[in-house]
Each structure stands twice: as C-alpha cells, then as structure tokens.
C-alpha cells in the first residue's frame, strides 16, 4: 500500500499524522524521539528531523504508539511500533515533528 | 500573557543543597515542556534542564548531572531545581523557560530569574 | 557540545539603519536555531525559531536566515527598542547551547 505522511499546522513544523486504512490520523508521542521524527521527515524529503511533544489539536484516529524507529529506516512503516490504532493516549499526546 | 516566577535563591555555602520553584500562570502549565536555564555573572546563557509536560522524560546538562534534579508538579503549576552538592561555579542567575510545545523545544517565554550565590 | 560562535560582540548603529548579527555552529544543526532578545528589566523574548520563523509577536523588520553551520539575524530600519542584547541558540541537539551574545548599541 502507499505510504503517507503529512505535516498539519506549517510547511516542515506540525502535527505528525499518517495514512492508514483510508484515513488520516496522528502519532502518540510515547517515545517519540528524533530518531523517529527523522524517518517520518525523510519520507518527506527532508534530510533530518526534531520530535516535538504534545503537539495535540488532532481529532480522530490515533494510528500509531511506541514507535521506535533506528534512524536508518526510509519509512516509519520499518519500524518498531504497536499495531496500528492500538494506543493508550489521548490528542493532547499527538506527536509533532519540524523538518529540515 | 504567560507568567513564570522563581524563588528559591539566596547565598549557600560550598556543598550544600537549595531548591528553587517557578510557579507558572495564564496557560495551561501541564501542557508544555519547561527548563532552566541560568547565567553566571560576565558568562553567557547555559540550559541545564528539561522535563517533559508529563514528567516522562527529563534531560541535563553534563556539568549537573548526577547533582541536580528537575521535577514538576502539574496540580500546582509549579516547576522545581533541586540543587545538591553545590560548587562556586553554580553561582549564577537561574531562569526557569517554557517550550513551545510539551517537550524539547525552543525557548518562548522566561521567568525574570533567582539568583543563586555559592560561596564559603 | 555543538558551539555557537556569534559575531560580532558589539555593534553600533542609529534608528533607521539596518545591522545582521552571525552566529556559526560548529557542526551542521539543520534549521534548528533560535535568536533571542534579552533587555534589562525584561524578560528575555523569542524572536526567531526553526531559522526563519517569526515568534507571534516579532515586527517583521527583523529576519532570519541560514542553514547547516552559518545563520543571520537581520533587523531592518532600527527603531529605538531594538537596542538590546541577541543570542542565538542551537536546539539540534543536548545539550542546547547558546551563542555568547550580541550588544547593540545606539551610535
């Protein structure tokens, strides 16, 4: 399946959501790090990445939980991480991300 | 328009211990990352701490590492510094910071600053 | 640690003019970089983060711009207020450091 990811709220600094299951959703930030937000701006072009913590302002379906990515990996769907929409959080924990 | 105020300094002497609060107003303190940040006197800016909004994760400086402790109590919108085993070269003004956002980020208000003063 | 080098220490300039202040990191940081404004009896502001991007509340005569080591703090058409004392600060990695600051002074 073609994998997607978006920034909500600036061009390279937001809200971190994916596409799954023909919908868009957000990211818990539960071990969030810049590892994982490094991958997520790599699959949007971009050469590196900073996690930021409880972005929140996101409404509907929490995708992903405990992502744990190397840094390595060309996209968050290589890593380690909960099965998708299995989560303990709230949108006040939403991942954000800033791109460079 | 957001409000952080210190307390806490004063003049200690060579390894003792201090502790130093931020009480925080007008926003909602339970959302954000906060730090402290001080300056000693002719020196420049040094962070030297950061705890995450939900207190899971927190971050030090090397040079307090092991001596200080960053906590937070959300109820009280209150952020704290537990100094230990302090040394002269603590002495500085110390500021407590808020993130823009819940955890690591970019510095976007400030406190006013305590000032904290070791020395025998 | 990632070292931030600003320069110049001082500056003079008149209301009107236009000055840039430098800061250099010593190893590529990104876009990660914040420029503040400290000022006696005043708490110090964010001006600038992510490189570029103005704080809510920052006059648009003041810009910044770079990427990797080398970064710029413009402020255009000085006005009396903008005397003060600017630090940038890399936020790329622990810990953030601080550039050892830029005093603008009225010519």
């Known amino acids: 399946s073609f994998q997607r990811v978006r920034i909500m709220g600036g061009t390279n600094r937001g809200r971190a959501e994916v596409y799954y299951n023909n919908e868009w959703g957000t990211i818990c930030d539960d071990d969030w790090d810049n590892n994982d937000a490094t991958v997520f701006c790599r699959m949007l072009g971009y050469s590196r990445g900073r996690a930021l913590s409880s972005y929140g302002g996101g409404s509907g379906n929490i995708w992903l939980d405990n992502v744990n990515c190397r840094g390595t990996e060309n996209s968050l769907w290589d890593c380690s991480k909960n099965s998708w929409g299995n989560h303990n959080c709230v949108h006040n924990e939403d991942a954000g991300v800033e791109c460079s | 328009e957001v409000q952080l105020v210190e307390s806490g300094g004063g003049l200690v002497q060579p390894g003792s211990s201090l502790k130093l609060s931020c009480v925080a107003s007008?926003?909602?303190?339970?959302?954000?990352?906060m730090n402290w940040i001080r300056q000693a006197p002719k020196k420049g800016l040094e962070w030297i701490a950061l705890?995450?909004?939900?207190?899971?994760?927190?971050y030090y400086a090397d040079s307090v590492k092991g001596r200080f402790t960053i906590s937070r109590d959300n109820s009280k919108n209150t952020l704290y510094l537990e100094m230990n085993s302090l040394r002269s070269e603590d002495t500085a003004m110390y500021y407590c910071?808020?993130?823009?956002?819940?955890?690591?980020?970019?510095?976007?208000?400030w406190g006013q600053g305590v000032m904290v003063t070791v020395s025998s | 640690d990632v070292q931030m080098t600003q320069s110049p220490s001082y500056l003079a300039a008149s209301p009107g003019e236009s000055v840039s202040i430098s800061c250099k990191a010593s190893?590529?940081?990104?876009?990660?970089l914040a420029w503040y404004q400290e000022k006696p009896e005043k708490t110090n502001k964010l001006l600038i983060y992510?490189?570029?991007t103005l704080q809510s509340g920052t006059p648009s005569r003041f810009s910044g711009s770079g990427s990797g080591t080398d970064f710029t703090l413009t402020i255009r058409n000085l006005e009396p207020e903008d005397f003060a004392v600017y630090y940038c600060?890399?936020?790329?990695?622990?810990?953030?450091?601080f550039g050892s600051g830029t005093k603008l002074e009225i010519k």
């Open positions: 910071a808020k993130s823009l956002t819940g955890g690591s980020d970019y510095f976007d208000s």
């Open positions: 007008k926003f909602t303190f339970s959302n954000y990352g």
């Open positions: 705890i995450y909004y939900n207190s899971n994760n927190k």
């Open positions: 190893k590529s940081i990104g876009t990660f």
């Open positions: 992510s490189g570029s």
């Open positions: 600060q890399q936020h790329d990695e622990y810990p953030f450091t």
